[in-house]
């Protein structure tokens, strides 16, 4: 139901892209967009499962929480949410499951209070490097974003551009160093094979990082050293075989960290010795008693915490003269 509102602010713009993006007339005070439900008391607008093909132009200026889930938006252009009067207090925006395949540079410009953004479950074949920074400057104005939810945004194989999906996402996260204040980043279920080594160092405010249900094989080149505020690191359901000494030491050095490592195919050979020793001593791994070996076959389902050095052997490498073809 729609209810009356008095706008707290007014907006004007000289930005050229706003000519088409901004509704010509300010919305009526009590207006609620067609196919949406509005509550001024809760400062919330819900346009959910309505097959909308574009963002409504007549969103009420009071909105703080906007749900645009389950639609068919396809593309978010520059200034997709720029309005007159502005959405000056829009703080939480959920666009999940709206069939977005392209998010353009400056899509979230003129949302100065946007703290939480959820783009999950959209096949983002084309995420502009400047989707979140809004500018191609080497150092852009800082983004107000605190939480960025990007779970399951990987497009089908045949729709991917001829480039690394990981690289495309990371470019958007790092552009202009705009996301220095980001505290929660969720990147679950994206088929990530690797994590580019520079991404975490440039997100120093992170408290929560979710990389679960990807295809990460190794963290060897990933540094957690700068993430002194990190409280939770979700690495469940990946393809991790072992964590090496450098990674173990960095994780142990984070003062508030909780690490989740369930459902990885741990290889319990001689390279696992350091990790087993660490697991027995550390308090940072949640549910560490559930971690089990996947390989080699003889070790399958053995609990890591119950292993000792005698269990962790490697088949000897024969010198060349003794090898057979």
């Amino acid at each position: 139901s729609s209810s009356p509102t008095s706008s707290a602010s007014s907006f004007s713009s000289s930005a050229p892209f706003l000519a088409s993006a901004v509704s010509a007339q300010p919305p009526l005070p009590d207006q609620c967009p067609a196919l949406c439900e509005c509550s001024e008391a809760a400062r919330t607008v819900k346009c959910v499962n309505r097959n909308l093909t574009e963002v409504p132009t007549d969103l009420p200026a009071y909105v703080r929480n906007l749900f645009l889930t389950g639609n068919q938006l396809a593309v978010l252009p520059a200034g997709a949410f720029a309005r007159r009067p502005p959405l000056a207090e829009l703080a939480a925006l959920n666009l999940s499951g709206s069939r977005l395949d392209e998010v353009r540079a400056g899509a979230f410009e003129h949302l100065p209070s946007l703290r939480q953004l959820d783009l999950s479950h959209n096949p983002l074949a084309d995420l502009s490097p400047f989707a979140f920074s809004g500018s191609n400057a080497s150092v852009s104005a800082p983004s107000p974003l605190v939480e960025l939810i990007l779970n399951h945004i990987v497009p089908p194989e045949d729709e991917r551009q001829n480039r690394s999906f990981e690289g495309m996402v990371v470019a958007a996260l790092l552009a202009g160093r705009a996301l220095q204040g980001l505290r929660r980043l969720e990147l679950a279920s994206n088929h990530f094979l690797y994590l580019p080594r520079d991404v975490l160092a440039q997100l120093p405010s992170l408290r929560h990082l979710d990389l679960s249900n990807n295809s990460l094989v190794s963290l060897t080149y990933v540094s957690f050293r700068n993430l002194t505020h990190l409280e939770s690191l979700h690495l469940e359901d990946n393809a991790l075989k072992v964590l090496h000494n450098g990674t173990l030491a960095e994780l142990q050095g984070l003062p508030h960290i909780r690490v989740f490592l369930d459902n990885n195919p741990w290889v319990c050979d001689c390279h696992m010795a350091d990790m087993v020793t660490w697991l027995k001593e550390t308090e940072v791994v949640q549910g560490k008693d559930r971690l089990t070996c996947a390989y080699p076959e003889k070790m399958r389902n053995r609990v890591l915490l119950e292993l000792n050095s005698a269990d962790l052997d490697c088949d000897p490498i024969l010198p060349p003269s003794l090898q057979t073809s």
């Epitope: 713009s13 930005a15 706003l18 003129h110 100065p112 405010s205």
Partner: antibody, heavy 121, light 107 residues
């Protein structure tokens, strides 16, 4: 050293107009969002208006919307507040203030010394 | 709009005292709160941002705490120059809203 210097205040009759200016120095003005905040005699602080660093977005309190216009000239390092249809309740010291670089949280890290606007017949 | 409510509205204390001023937001603002000090005839000065971070040049006797809706400004040992009015401000939204102020006076 960051400096903000307001000017343009004075005595004006109800219904009249004034234009306040704020000259900025000691920092990159074109990269900073700016704001006007006012304080009626013996009262607390009231936000009036804000403008993006680029000038592309302007925001107003309900109490001044449609009467006041904020603008900036980045080539002159100057912020403006055009005040029309002034009312007695607009009487206050008007401060210009700079938004800090840290938007987590938004804060006003430097303020001018203020200029007094008196609306009276 | 978010309402910011400070208490007390005025407070008398002596040099050397420990003083606490509280600020409550009408909705959660995480740790996105700032504190300002204003002396008579002067502009406000930013003291603390992000609830507990001291602005450069501010003496360490000032400290802030809190998260969500309830916040506190503490002056551990009052100095003569600390007698002033203190304002809290929410910085979660781009458009600032201030508390009504707490006037700290000499007893």
């Amino acid at each position: 050293e960051v400096q903000l210097l307001e000017s343009g205040g004075g005595l004006v009759q109800p219904g009249g107009s004034l234009r306040l200016s704020c000259a900025a120095s000691g920092f990159t003005f074109s990269g900073s969002s700016m704001s006007w905040v006012r304080q009626a005699p013996g009262k607390g602080l009231e936000w009036v208006s804000s403008i993006y660093y680029s000038g592309s977005g302007t925001y107003y309190a309900d109490s001044v919307k449609g009467r006041f216009t904020i603008s900036r000239d980045n080539s002159k390092n100057t912020l403006y507040l055009q005040m029309n249809s002034l009312r007695a309740e607009d009487t206050a010291v008007y401060y210009c203030a700079r938004y800090g670089r840290n938007v987590h949280p938004y804060n006003l890290d430097y303020w001018g010394q203020g200029t007094l606007v008196t609306v009276s017949s | 709009d978010i309402q910011m409510t400070q208490s007390p509205s005025s407070l008398s204390a002596s040099v050397g005292d420990r003083v606490t001023i509280t600020c409550r937001a009408s909705q959660s603002i995480s740790s996105y709160l700032n504190w300002y000090q204003q002396k008579p005839g002067k502009a406000p000065k930013l003291l603390i941002y992000a609830a507990s971070s001291l602005q450069s040049g501010v003496p360490s006797r000032f400290s802030g705490s809190g998260s969500g809706t309830d916040f506190t400004l503490t002056i551990s040992s009052l100095q003569p120059e600390d007698f002033a009015t203190y304002y809290c401000q929410q910085g979660y939204y781009y458009l600032p809203t201030f508390g009504q102020g707490t006037k700290l006076e000499i007893k």
